[in-house]
Amino acid sequence: NECPKLQPPVYGKIEPSQAVYSFKDQVLVSCDTGYKVLKDNGVMDTFQIECLKDGAWSNKIPTCKIVDCGAPAGLKHGLVTFSTRNNLTTYKSEIRYSCQQPYYKMLHNTTGVYTCSAHGTWTNEVLKRSLPTCLPVCGQPSRALPNLVKRIIGGRNAELGLFPWQALIVVEDTSRVPNDKWFGSGALLSESWILTAAHVLRSQRRDNTVIPVSKEHVTVYLGLHDVRDKSGAVNSSAARVILHPDFNIQNYNHDIALVQLQKPVPLGAHVMPICLPRPEPEGPAPHMLGLVAGWGISNPNVTVDEIILSGTRTLSDVLQYVKLPVVSHAECKASYESRSGNYSVTENMFCAGYYEGGKDTCLGDSGGAFVIFDEMSQHWVAQGLVSWGGPEECGSKQVYGVYTKVSNYVDWLWEEMNSPRAVRDLQVER
């Protein structure tokens, strides 16, 4: 009662391999790595057959089929390319994930190469079965920022795409009687978060209580160049308005806030985030040059008091920018202490500007980012936020602009952006 000699399947083997198989002998059919046993349209690792009493095998020898990982999953803000000809998805085939450059980059700087494993899954050496993450590229505008010194006071225009992180924040407080409307600037930190100054988002009350404006009253414009033409801009409503809990209206200490957008904004040449600095108390060093942009007052003949009294918020139609040097804390403190009025320059602030004046930020520029180029990382970093200035006119001699020192708040910002109160689980690269 011998059974016929067995031929192992292509890409497979039979164990045990014997010269003769008799009644009740069993053999196990298995496949090479990267192949699976195919029997009656079912896929399995091994298949057992037995030599029956009548000298026949209990089943036919199955075939070995190459493992197929199937079509790779799509990647948010990324794409997948096949490294193997004919877009093969079978064992040992390779694919490469990449992010939508230059607006997104891969987290952990992985190669993005995945191989179809013997288990039928696309696998990466580092990430194993997890997909890579495409994070927004920060602080790298698609057009290089020029070295020209321009001014916001009496200034010239910025070109579209020079400050892709720049946001116009419009607050229309309909809870007020009569309605109150004002604006400020902000800086995009990720697809869903805007960094700005707390005083921009504080309700303009008749007392000094710090109460944030309702989220329903906030509109954010991104990719905006000329405020008269908002057609090319992305506008978004706010999901949350978060003022720093210690913001003090009397001295503008802790003048920092966040807006979470209702929906993530698509990034592109005109909408890109700015980088946050490393958390360090020193802040930017004196004499370092920074850039700040805004739609605030650009007419040097109009006084701040005239604007406040008239109730209008005169603004520049086209985004303006200025290059300003950081001023030492001691010099700035001294310049304000010599003035009448209670002006305290705290450790959470730094100053920028020229002793001789002429270049400055002004009313309406509030909340915009003071950005400095970081040579090490080759990114622009938001070191400051336009906060306040002296009692004299913008650009006056020896009146420096005062900026919120962002590096003192990096931990608070990450905490808020990743808190469970955030509307969605939005990842931001640290």
């Epitope: 809870s175 009687v177 009350r205 008749r206 000094n208 109460i211 309702s214």
Partner: antibody
């Protein structure tokens, strides 16, 4: 139009408590605080405290921290002030105001008498 | 606590005259950052609720006649009625909102 309607006059015995109401209409109740002000007969105005309906935060004039309790019912857009341990010194007209004093209630006269 | 002192406590003027009344605070009510003085003026006519006239020391509340003008900064403030009308008979109060709220004692305006 904006209105703040206060509850009617109260005659209460010394040592008792009284709860005054102020119903708001015509504006966003939660986005504006409600202030309470006391005026004794023939005297000036005295600020008692304010309450902010959006988050329930309250600020009191120190003098009134043990005397008054401020609350709101957002569902009915109504603010309340309860006055405790009343004495003749508490006999006064009590006003509520809203939208940062742009609008005032008509006042509630509280008379404390045995 | 901030103390508010109003003067005079009362004054009598004829219709059409210009009148000024003063309000002094025990500390500055100016917040340099906002360039605002946190001081308001109220009018209370006999048997009525108070009415807001001026806030931020000089901003007229909507609907208030332009004969009412607020001025001053820091600790010294003035309410001016350029041409007094019979209906201006009232007590005028100032109030600070720099640190919580405090009312002044009031100035009673009588018409001769």
């Amino acid at each position: 139009q904006v209105q703040l309607k206060q509850s009617g006059p109260e005659l209460v015995k010394p040592g008792a408590s009284v709860k005054l109401s102020c119903k708001a209409s015509g504006y966003t109740f939660t986005s504006n605080d409600i202030n309470w002000v006391k005026q004794r007969p023939g005297q000036g105005l005295e600020w008692i405290g304010w309450i902010y309906p959006r988050d329930g935060s309250i600020k009191y004039n120190e003098k009134f921290t043990d005397k008054a309790t401020l609350t709101v019912d957002v569902s009915s857009s109504t603010a309340y002030m309860e006055l405790h341990s009343l004495t003749s010194e508490d006999s006064a007209v009590y006003f509520c105001s809203g939208v940062e004093d742009s609008y005032w209630g008509q006042g509630t006269l509280v008379t404390v008498s045995s | 606590d901030i103390v508010m002192t109003q003067s005079p406590s009362s004054l009598a003027v004829s219709a059409g005259e210009r009148v000024t009344m003063s309000c002094k605070s025990s500390q500055s009510l100016l917040i340099s950052r906002t360039r605002k003085n946190y001081l308001s003026w109220y009018q209370q006519k006999p048997g009525q609720s108070p009415k807001l006239l001026i806030y931020w020391a000089s901003t007229r509340e909507s609907g208030v006649p332009d004969r009412f003008t607020g001025s001053g900064s820091g600790t010294d403030f003035t309410l001016t009625i350029s041409s007094v009308q019979a209906e201006d008979l009232a007590v005028y109060y100032c109030k600070q909102s720099y640190n919580l709220y405090t009312f002044g004692g009031g100035t009673k305006l009588e018409i001769k």
